[in-house]
């Protein structure tokens, strides 16, 4: 049985330009997490695995840089970063949990963070 | 130049074990990881698993997990490969393999190990 | 375990056709693909990685493509010097699997 919670950042704004950490945790479990993936939509950012490091997706290497932890830092933001995010958690032995956050980019600097909220 | 020189063809009995090497040179051979495939028949490929050599980390198939054991010797940044309790199914040809930089693709592969299970 | 499927064992071309080979996972892997070419008698070599993206040095007739469950791999005018064995494989999960592989031969 699946027991554990992704929190996640939640709603997210961050000005044209700058940087943003997409941070996600997994709590109320002991499974292990062994990897976690990033998406965007239908891309692929990057993949964490607990023994294997990191992978970055070539169209986002300039741009994106590993944690901290298991996050990601998403530098030099463009409107074009608006959407939304997912953090695949797969663990052993509950399986896959995933989190969600949606990043606003800004063009002037109204940009604030959201609250933390939490996805079962 | 990039190079991975693994160790000469085995001949061994069923149910003995195997250790491969593969030495590396061209590269700091603690900022990448080391992975091992099988390729039996010719032509079918199989991940067996990874190992970090920075902290020993590893990564197994679970097909192998328990019979093979992966390992690494920083001093001489040679990658190892045991596996045991051979049948002929293990009969295959064996390569360590090294991905990019933050890329988990393999773009440099050993010459390859044959192993050969027979009594 | 994901499941990479080449559908084609076998693949026959002539010199100068275009070819297209595919490899279908069994659950959505993203772009984690990677394509190698295995000559007789030799190790694999990287040509494409992350489903699209060609390797350092690889000529520019072999291209990549697709997301998600299905890639394809092109050659667009096939070479004689490319007879080999076409392997995908997909590093979104491990253990990291590969395609039974497609063995091009020219006529």
């Known amino acids: 049985m699946m027991t554990g919670t992704i929190e996640t950042t939640g709603n997210i704004s961050a000005e044209k330009g700058g940087s943003i950490i997409l941070q996600c945790h997994l709590s109320s479990t002991t499974a292990q997490v062994t990897q976690v993936n990033w998406e965007q939509q239908d891309q692929l950012l990057a993949i964490c695995n607990a023994a294997l490091g990191w992978h970055i997706s070539p169209s986002f290497k300039d741009r994106v840089a590993p944690g901290p932890g298991l996050g990601l830092t998403l530098q030099s933001l463009t409107v074009n970063d608006t959407g939304e995010y997912f953090c695949i958690y797969h663990t052993y032995p509950d399986g896959t949990y995933t989190g969600r956050i949606f990043l606003e980019v800004l063009e002037s600097s109204v940009a604030e963070h959201g609250a933390r909220f939490q996805i079962p | 130049e990039v190079q991975l020189q693994q160790s000469g063809p085995e001949l061994v009995k069923p149910g003995a074990s195997v250790k491969i090497s593969c030495k590396t040179s061209?590269?700091?051979?603690?900022?990448?990881?080391m992975h091992w495939v099988k390729q039996s028949h010719g032509k079918n490929l199989e991940w067996i698993g990874g190992?970090?050599?920075?902290?020993?980390?590893?990564s197994y198939n679970q097909k192998f997990k328990g019979r093979a054991t992966l390992t690494v010797d920083k001093s001489s940044s040679t990658a190892y490969m045991e596996l045991r309790s051979l049948t002929s199914d293990d009969s295959a040809v064996y390569y360590c393999?090294?991905?990019?930089?933050?890329?988990?693709?393999?773009?440099?592969w050993g010459q390859g190990t044959s192993v050969t299970v027979s009594s | 375990d994901i499941v990479m499927t080449q559908s084609h064992k076998f693949m026959s071309t002539s010199v100068g056709d275009r070819v297209n080979i595919t490899c279908k996972a069994s659950?959505?892997?993203?772009?984690?693909v990677a394509w190698y070419q295995q000559k007789p008698g030799q190790s694999p070599k990287l040509l494409i990685y992350?489903?699209?993206y060609r390797y350092t040095g690889v000529p520019d007739r072999f291209t990549g493509s697709g997301s998600g469950t299905d890639f394809t791999f092109t050659i667009s005018s096939v070479q004689a010097e490319d007879l080999a064995v076409y392997h995908c494989?997909?590093?979104?999960?491990?253990?990291?699997?590969f395609g039974g592989g497609t063995k091009l031969e020219i006529k």
């Open positions: 393999a090294r991905p990019g930089w933050y890329n988990y693709a393999m773009d440099y």
């Open positions: 061209g590269y700091t051979f603690t900022e990448y990881t």
């Open positions: 190992i970090n050599p920075n902290n020993g980390g590893t």
């Open positions: 659950q959505g892997v993203s772009t984690a």
């Open positions: 992350s489903a699209s």
């Open positions: 494989q997909q590093h979104y999960i491990t253990p990291w699997t």
